[in-house]
Interface confidence: low
């Protein structure tokens, strides 16, 4: 599930990881675009083990997953989590 959560709060990610997370461990991905109170794009991966990881948007693996999800969900608009 590819989701965009627009917020007027500050940045959420205090540190970002580029470590690969296998797709089978991923529950969902959230994208906070640049702006809305944060000067950078943030990608947050919700893992199936109940943890959350902020991912480096430049990491090649997350870009591949996002591209695939974009194609998959192009017909349906993203739904906010909260």
């Amino acid at each position: 599930v590819l989701e965009v959560y627009y917020t007027h709060l500050r940045c959420r990610c205090v540190q970002e990881s580029s470590v690969f997370i296998p797709r089978r461990f991923i529950d969902r991905i959230q994208i906070s675009p640049r702006g809305n109170g944060c000067p950078r794009k943030e990608i947050i991966v919700w893992k199936k083990n109940k943890s959350v990881v902020c991912v480096d948007p430049q990491a090649e693996w997350i870009q591949r997953i996002m591209e695939m999800l974009r194609k998959k969900s192009s017909s349906t608009p993203p739904v906010p989590v909260f």
């Epitope: 959420r12 540190q15 970002e16 990881s17 470590v19 997370i21 947050i44 919700w46 109940k50 943890s51 959350v52 990881v53 989590v81 909260f82």
Partner: antibody, heavy 123, light 111 residues
Framework: EVQLQESGPGILQPSQTLNLTCSFS??????????VGWIRQPSGKGLEWLAH???????RYNPALKSRLTISKETSKNQVFLKIANVDTADTATYYC???????????????WGQGTTVTVSS | DIVLTQSPASLAVSLGQRATISCRAS??????????MHWYQQKPGQPPKLLIF???DLESGIPARFSGSGSRTDFTLTVNPVETDDVATYFC?????????FGGGTKLEIK
């Protein structure tokens, strides 16, 4: 404001089933990422995590006690329940209800606690 | 299970001085660059209160004299300067692996 309140029988006998209720306000267990759990503390001793339940009905148990534990929820009533079967004197403790995390869904620490309910198992 | 060993079991510190509490895990509690170690304060007759989450993040409303540090297996809670209100028992907790576990506690007293 998040508030949690535990209730229990106070005293029960060995081999009985302990039924605990956590009534909470200030959040809903239907909200994505919310979890409620139980922790106990024998008098003057340390803390032991027992179980927790997530908004999506995912349930986690302490393996050392799993065979005796059942956690459930009544989302519409803002309540979570814990049953401990076949209690023994070692189950005498203060039982705390907790809400888990809430900081951007990382869901891994006990952010809010009830005042606790004291349970004594005695013959 | 991940065993958390706190040291010392108790310590007495003079007002205004620094108190340092250690928590050592039997295996790493880090995951994807995040340390899943948290600290709580418990006063007599009260439930524990969250102080620090993810090793070093200060919970909202907690005074800045509390700080946390560490990674993988070795973590520290520092109280500096110590005040009379800090007399309590402090617990560490890990949530990297089920079952989530707590340290045995460290009792802080005023010298």
């Amino acid at each position: 404001e998040v508030q949690l309140q535990e209730s229990g029988p106070g005293i029960l006998q060995p081999s009985q089933t302990l039924n605990l209720t956590c009534s909470f306000s200030g959040f809903s267990l239907s909200t994505f990422g919310m979890g409620v759990g139980w922790i106990r503390q024998p008098s003057g001793k340390g803390l032991e995590w027992l179980a927790h339940i997530w908004w999506d009905d995912d349930r986690r148990y302490n393996p050392a006690l799993k065979s005796r534990l059942t956690i459930s929820k009544e989302t519409s009533k803002n309540q979570v329940f814990l049953k401990i079967a076949n209690v023994d004197t070692a189950d005498t403790a203060t039982y705390y209800c907790t809400r888990i995390a809430g900081y951007y869904g990382s869901r891994d620490w006990f952010a809010y606690w009830g005042q606790g309910t004291t349970v004594t198992v005695s013959s | 299970d991940i065993v958390l060993t706190q040291s010392p079991a108790s310590l007495a510190v003079s007002l205004g001085q620094r108190a340092t509490i250690s928590c050592r895990a039997s295996e790493s509690v880090d995951n994807s660059g995040i340390s899943f170690m948290h600290w709580y304060q418990q006063k007599p007759g009260q439930p524990p209160k969250l102080l620090i989450f993810r090793a070093s993040d200060l919970e909202s409303g907690i005074p800045a004299r509390f700080s946390g540090s560490g990674s993988r297996t070795d973590f520290t809670l520092t109280v500096n300067p110590v005040e009379t209100d800090d007399v309590a028992t402090y617990f560490c907790q890990q949530s990297n692996k089920d079952p989530w576990t707590f340290g045995g506690g460290t009792k802080l007293e005023i010298k």
